[in-house]
């Protein structure tokens, strides 16, 4: 029951965290543009993996895509893959992990092949989430080092006379869902793969004892059933299959009465 | 077509109070901000501030804190521009204008003439 | 705040004759999230209230005839009339819409000379 019940928590929390990988991988706050210290704009930035947004104070927001791909500095196209490889081995953990999940009978499944194929979504979403957690890492201490730089060129005079504000971005809402949600992911993949522990038990192995009676000779091995460990030879290989195609069409609604600053 | 009526003129002596409105008309009025804008006579704009009548939030700028104060009601599409301890320095025509994306005024009110005088 | 300053103060064309206006701004309206220069230019004859003529420094307003024209960026910009008619005869304001609080230049009066 602890098994079942250890596995199926496993499965929701990591569930949940794909689920806020995706959200954050889509989302546009990546950085916002930094308030504090700042003149007070009636314009507000804010950028995303795959657009950068301005929002104005009519209410009207704006956002572009990048869409160049050489263009785009070597540590964001990092940081696409890093969530792009986070959300695909989170997408094949959960597929291998329901097929896994011991409430859910699938023919003659045996314990030994759930076990394995828990384990397995358990590393998936263990690797996922570093993934996840690596990639807004890397952001943040992008932006952590641009901050700082544009703080020091902070105002760049022409003459002493005009001045020119550069934007300093900080800490967009879609950072703090990446790191939950690998944290999640994570913790979700741990479960997993104590909940495979459970599931596999240790194989009891006697040596044979042999009674030899008169008239005739029986060889009896006490155990009666044996348990396997999942690991052996005889576990049946399950092929998955990952639809894995998934598209996302964005519109965006102008002017919005929620986007005033 | 995007109109905004405001009040007519009003005559004050100093101390009292005015209450200047600006009805707005031909769209969602809560989608746009309404900005206040002071020409004193024979001067140039002068930007007040605006009222978001969607959150009823309001900025104002530094000279027009306090004697100064937006309002809405939005029921019936109108902006208010209410000024009390009227001076004589506050004789001027305000104008309301709709901010629209661009962060542009792009409707005005035809400009309403506040005179203070004893 | 931002201050906006208009030159000249006054401008005398003749009929079918260029204008042209210039406003400075004391911080750079650029901004590099969309690269659009947050700056209006609006027309006000006597007795009415503003127009506006131009947004984002070089957009035109709809219905304002083409020989109205705007440019510039960062700190500053221009506002051309490439042929005066008699109906332009007016003040113009520049506008920054970038910073709070919103400021408008001191005003350029257009006559015919």
């Known amino acids: 029951m602890a098994v079942t019940a250890c596995q199926g928590l496993g499965f929701v929390v990591s569930l949940i965290g794909i689920a806020g990988i995706i959200a954050a991988t889509c989302m546009d706050q990546w950085s916002t543009q930094d308030l504090y210290n700042n003149p007070v704009t009636a314009v507000f930035n804010y950028q995303g993996l795959w657009r950068s947004c301005v929002r104005e104070s009519s209410g009207f927001t704006e956002c572009r895509g990048y869409f160049t791909l050489l263009g785009l500095p070597a540590m964001l196209q990092a940081v696409r893959a890093l969530m792009i490889v986070g959300i695909v081995l989170g997408a094949i953990g959960l597929l291998v992990s329901i097929f896994a999940l011991k409430c859910i009978r699938i023919g003659s499944m045996e314990d030994s092949a759930k076990a394995n194929m828990t384990l397995t979504s358990g590393i998936m979403f263990i690797v996922s989430g570093l993934c996840a957690i690596a990639g807004v890492s890397v952001f943040a201490n992008m932006l952590v080092t641009n901050f700082w730089m544009s703080t020091a060129n902070m105002y760049t005079g022409m003459g002493g006379m005009v001045q020119t504000v550069q934007t300093r971005y900080t800490f967009g809402a879609a950072l703090f869902v990446g790191w939950v949600a690998g944290g999640l992911t994570l913790i979700g993949g741990v479960m997993m793969c104590i909940a495979c522990r459970g599931l596999a038990p240790e194989e009891t192995n006697y040596k044979a004892v042999s009674y030899h009676a008169s008239g005739h000779s029986v060889a009896y091995k006490p155990g009666g059933f044996k348990a396997s460990t999942g690991f052996g030879s005889n576990t049946k290989n399950k092929k998955i299959y990952d639809g894995g195609a998934r598209t996302e069409d964005e519109v965006q609604s102008y002017p919005s009465k929620h986007d005033y600053v | 077509e995007v109109q905004l009526v405001q009040s007519g003129s009003e005559l004050k002596k100093p101390g009292a109070s005015v209450k200047v409105s600006c009805k707005a008309s031909g769209y969602t009025f809560t989608n746009y901000g309404i900005n206040w804008v002071r020409q004193a006579p024979g001067q140039g704009l002068e930007w007040m501030g605006w009222i978001n009548p969607y959150t009823g939030e309001t900025t104002y700028a530094e000279e027009f804190k306090g004697r100064f104060v937006f309002s809405l009601d939005t029921s019936v599409s109108t902006a208010y521009l209410q000024i009390s301890s009227l001076k004589a320095e506050d004789t001027a025509v305000y104008f309301c204008a709709r901010l629209y994306y661009g962060n542009r005024f792009d409707s005005w009110g035809q400009g309403t003439l506040v005179t203070v005088s004893s | 705040d931002i201050v906006m300053t208009q030159s000249p103060d006054s401008l005398a064309v003749s009929l079918g004759e260029r204008a042209t206006i210039n406003c400075k701004s004391s911080q750079s309206l650029l901004n590099s999230g969309n690269q659009r220069n947050y700056l209006a230019w609006y027309q006000q004859k006597p007795g009415q209230p503003p127009k506006l003529l131009i947004y984002w420094a070089s957009t035109r307003e709809s219905g304002v005839p083409d020989r109205f024209s705007g440019s510039g960026s960062g700190t500053d910009f221009t506002l051309t009339i490439s042929s005066l008619q008699a109906e332009d005869v007016a003040v113009y304001y520049c506008?920054?819409?970038?910073?709070?609080?919103?400021?408008f230049g001191g005003g350029t009066k257009v006559e015919i000379k």
């Open positions: 506008q920054q819409a970038y910073y709070y609080p919103l400021t």
